[in-house]
């Protein structure tokens, strides 16, 4: 791969335009933040492939890594990749923004990590501090990556001075996850049960031959002991399992169940806990919110999602205008309810290539023998605007009229504009807006009708032109939230016998 300019580091001016070229023996592509920005790809007569990335109106946010790579690395000897780092010094951008994954740094062992605070200017001096601390920490800084070193479990910020202004980065949180030398896991057949149902828990240890299990649980505290059963999972080496089974649970069995495992050889121990909830009866409750008015765009697919918690597993039904919905054989509607955790569910209604008739009142009902919940919303279908008619007429009054008719949902706005110089319009001259109250030479009359059956608005607008002394290009533009459409007509003076 050949990259021009070769880099590996470039410093470019803010607001400038810059061209990066990459060429190779197979198709090549530029990548930025794991995505492919718009670029021009070509193949030369000699068989080399190239891609040109034009960076326009550069800002500090364009600072970062750019990679050129083979578009399809199959069959190539090496998965070759060229890296280029671009700085765009920009005093309006302090530290480059980070996403949540970069702000919270989790570790499972003592290892070197990087606090990724980066600036747009390689000349800036950057220091690292504990959050709310003034003392700079002696950690090496790389302008392309950030501060690298071994960090304690704390929160840190970076500081720099841009001009006469001190700028702080977001805080970075370093958090070391505790990893024990005995690997214990506890799970339950169900963590939520109704009174009278069984509680069954399993505690599993991997990689130890001789261990001792000790359970603590709510019943134990009141002196009612339950004898656990210990077994070996024969198909796996050194997987030892302890099972605690409580038949016919009572409300008092709610609480924390802890499995403590000790191994006497190295004097290691570990414990894991799980929370069990015994409920008097089942429940269904909505989580999050769904607005009472939802929108879908005509001929596009739309998924409506409801999240709820329930135990025991509920039946879920969807209704439209009080009629039960089911998966349609034509594949126009798809219903699915997923169990995303033990008691949490996501129910989805997918409308494939939405039709006008699918507007209406939708309800999701989730229920079982103990409880039920329902959620309703109105679905509005948005239809992109279309100009259906644009016509010009010469009434006897001497004035000339142009009529524009169009439809869409939500209600379209109408914009009239005109251009007097046909040769230079509209590329060189901007069109003039018409129909403003201050304009004496044009008058506007607009009527709006809502068509119930088609569930869309029709707009009819008539533009009256008082005196047309030379050919005029009149444009009608309709616009709504999901699109716009334009038509144009040329209006000629009465005196001219033909239209251009």
């Amino acid at each position: 791969l050949v990259v021009t300019p070769p880099g590996p580091e470039l410093v470019l001016n803010v607001s400038s335009t810059f061209v990066l070229t990459c060429s190779g023996s197979a198709p090549v592509v530029w990548e930025r933040m794991s995505q492919e920005p718009p670029q021009e790809m070509a193949k030369a007569q000699d068989g080399t492939f190239s891609s040109v990335l034009t960076l326009t109106n550069l800002t500090g946010l364009d600072t970062g890594e750019y990679f050129c790579t083979h578009n399809d690395s199959r069959g190539l000897e090496t998965d070759e990749r060229k890296r280029l780092y671009i700085f765009v010094p920009d005093p309006t951008v302090g530290f480059l923004p980070n996403d949540a994954e970069e702000l919270f740094i989790f570790l499972t062992e003592i290892t070197e990590i990087t606090i990724p605070c980066r600036v747009t200017d390689p000349q800036l001096v950057v220091t690292l501090h504990e959050k709310k601390g003034d003392v700079a920490l002696p950690v090496p800084y790389d302008h392309q990556r950030g501060f690298s070193g071994i960090f304690e479990d704390r929160s840190y910020i970076c500081k720099t001075t841009i001009g006469d202004r001190e700028v702080d980065s977001d805080a970075y949180y370093v958090y070391r996850l505790q990893v024990s030398s005995i690997n214990v896991s506890v799970n339950a057949v169900q963590t939520v049960v109704r009174q009278g149902e069984n509680i069954t828990l399993m505690c599993i240890v991997i990689g130890n031959e001789v261990v001792n299990f000790e359970w603590t649980y709510p019943r134990k505290e009141s002196g009612r002991l339950v004898e656990p059963v210990t077994d070996f999972l024969l198909d796996m080496p050194y997987h030892i399992r302890s099972i605690l089974h409580i038949p016919s649970a009572e409300l008092e069995d709610s609480g924390t169940y802890t499995c403590n495992v000790t191994e006497s050889v190295n004097d290691h121990q570990d414990e894991k806990a799980i929370n069990i909830t015994v409920v008097e009866s089942g429940y269904v409750r909505l989580l999050g919110e769904v607005g009472t008015l939802q929108f879908a765009e005509l001929h596009r697919s739309r998924t409506l999602q409801v999240v709820f918690e329930a135990y025991p597993p509920p039946t879920v039904l969807w209704f439209k205008d009080n009629r039960t919905l089911g998966d349609s054989s034509a594949g126009e509607i798809a219903l699915s309810t997923r169990n995303v955790s033990e008691t949490r569910y996501v129910s989805e209604l997918t409308l494939v290539r939405v039709k006008v008739a699918e507007a209406g009142h939708y309800t999701m009902r989730a229920f079982h023998e103990d409880a039920e919940v329902q959620l309703s919303f109105q679905l509005q279908i948005n239809v992109p605007v279309r100009v259906l008619e644009l016509s010009e007429s010469h009434p006897d009054s001497g004035e000339q009229t142009v009529r524009c008719r169009g439809r869409g949902m939500p209600q379209p706005n109408i914009i009239w504009s005109a251009c007097r110089d046909l040769k230079r319009c509209p590329r060189e001259l901007p069109p003039t807006l018409l129909g403003n109250s201050s304009e004496e030479e044009s008058q506007l009359e607009t009527n709006v009708t809502y068509w119930e059956e088609e569930q869309e608005f029709e707009v009819v607008s008539t533009l009256r032109l008082q005196h047309v002394d030379r050919p005029l290009s009149v444009r009608c533009t309709l616009r709504n939230a999901v699109g716009q459409d334009t038509q144009e007509v040329i209006v000629v003076p009465h005196s001219l016998p033909f239209k251009v």
């Epitope: 923004p97 980070n98 996403d99 949540a100 994954e101 702000l103 919270f104 989790f106 702080d168 977001d170 805080a171 949180y173 958090y175 996850l177 709610s254 609480g255 924390t256 806990a273 929370n275 909830t277 989580l287 999050g288 919110e289």
Partner: antibody, heavy 127, light 107 residues
């Protein structure tokens, strides 16, 4: 300087509507969960609701469900609370705060608290 | 829903005293607990998260402990700035719940 500034409070009649705003500065707003908390006169703190980084997850306390809506505009570094069908018991100082919710680690989730708060805006519901 | 109960509701103490505030959860919440301080007319301030982790910039006289259902906030040696109301707060993946508060005033 990391800062949150609430606005939009005032006097509103029962059944009426009000929209509170919270402007954020000094941090990457789009990378954080945000929360609304309220405090009735002479009473304790009550969580109203929260919203994740891109607005795809929203949660709220039962007493405001169906009446209040939380939203955000990351391009404007702003958090909003749309209050509809207000009641006398909604009278309070409303605070917005930054909620430190790291991405999940396997099955575990962690939480580092509400570390930045605004000064609050007062909402009075009275006829 | 999980209830958080703080005790005492009011506590009278003098500068230099060691102060302990308790927060009880109606069921096991592991270590999913934070503590806040609120001075009159001001916004709350985060002191402790994850039951025992001290927030940056908070004096080391504040400490938190506990897990499961019983938690404590300890102020090692009360300073004039510490006369305020303290709240515990439980969190899970889709809600937050505050205790009713403990007011620490001058004896």
């Amino acid at each position: 300087e990391v800062q949150l500034v609430e606005s939009g409070g005032g006097l509103v009649q029962p059944g009426g509507s009000l929209r509170l705003s919270c402007g954020a500065s000094g941090f990457t707003f789009s990378s954080y969960w945000m929360t609304w908390v309220r405090q009735a006169p002479g009473k304790g703190l009550e969580w109203v609701g929260n919203i994740n980084q891109d607005g795809s997850e929203k949660y709220s306390v039962d007493s405001v469900k169906g009446r209040f809506t939380i939203s955000r505009d990351n391009a404007k570094n702003s958090l909003y609370l749309q209050m509809n069908r207000v009641r006398a018991e909604d009278t309070a100082v409303y605070y917005c705060s930054r909620d430190l919710v790291p991405p999940r680690q396997g099955d575990n989730y962690y939480y580092f608290g509400m570390d930045v708060w605004g000064l609050g805006t007062t909402v009075t519901v009275s006829s | 829903d999980i209830q958080m109960t703080q005790s005492p509701s009011t506590l009278s103490a003098s500068v230099g005293d060691r102060v302990i505030i308790t927060c009880r959860a109606s069921q096991n919440i592991n270590n999913w607990l934070a503590w806040y301080q609120q001075q009159p007319g001001k916004a709350p301030k985060l002191l402790i998260y994850e039951a025992s982790s001290l927030e940056s910039g908070v004096p080391s006289r504040f400490s938190g402990s506990g897990s499961g259902t019983e938690f404590t906030l300890t102020i090692g040696s009360l300073q004039p700035d510490d006369f305020a109301t303290y709240y515990c707060q439980h969190y899970n993946s889709y809600s937050r719940t505050f205790g009713q508060g403990t007011k620490v005033d001058i004896k």
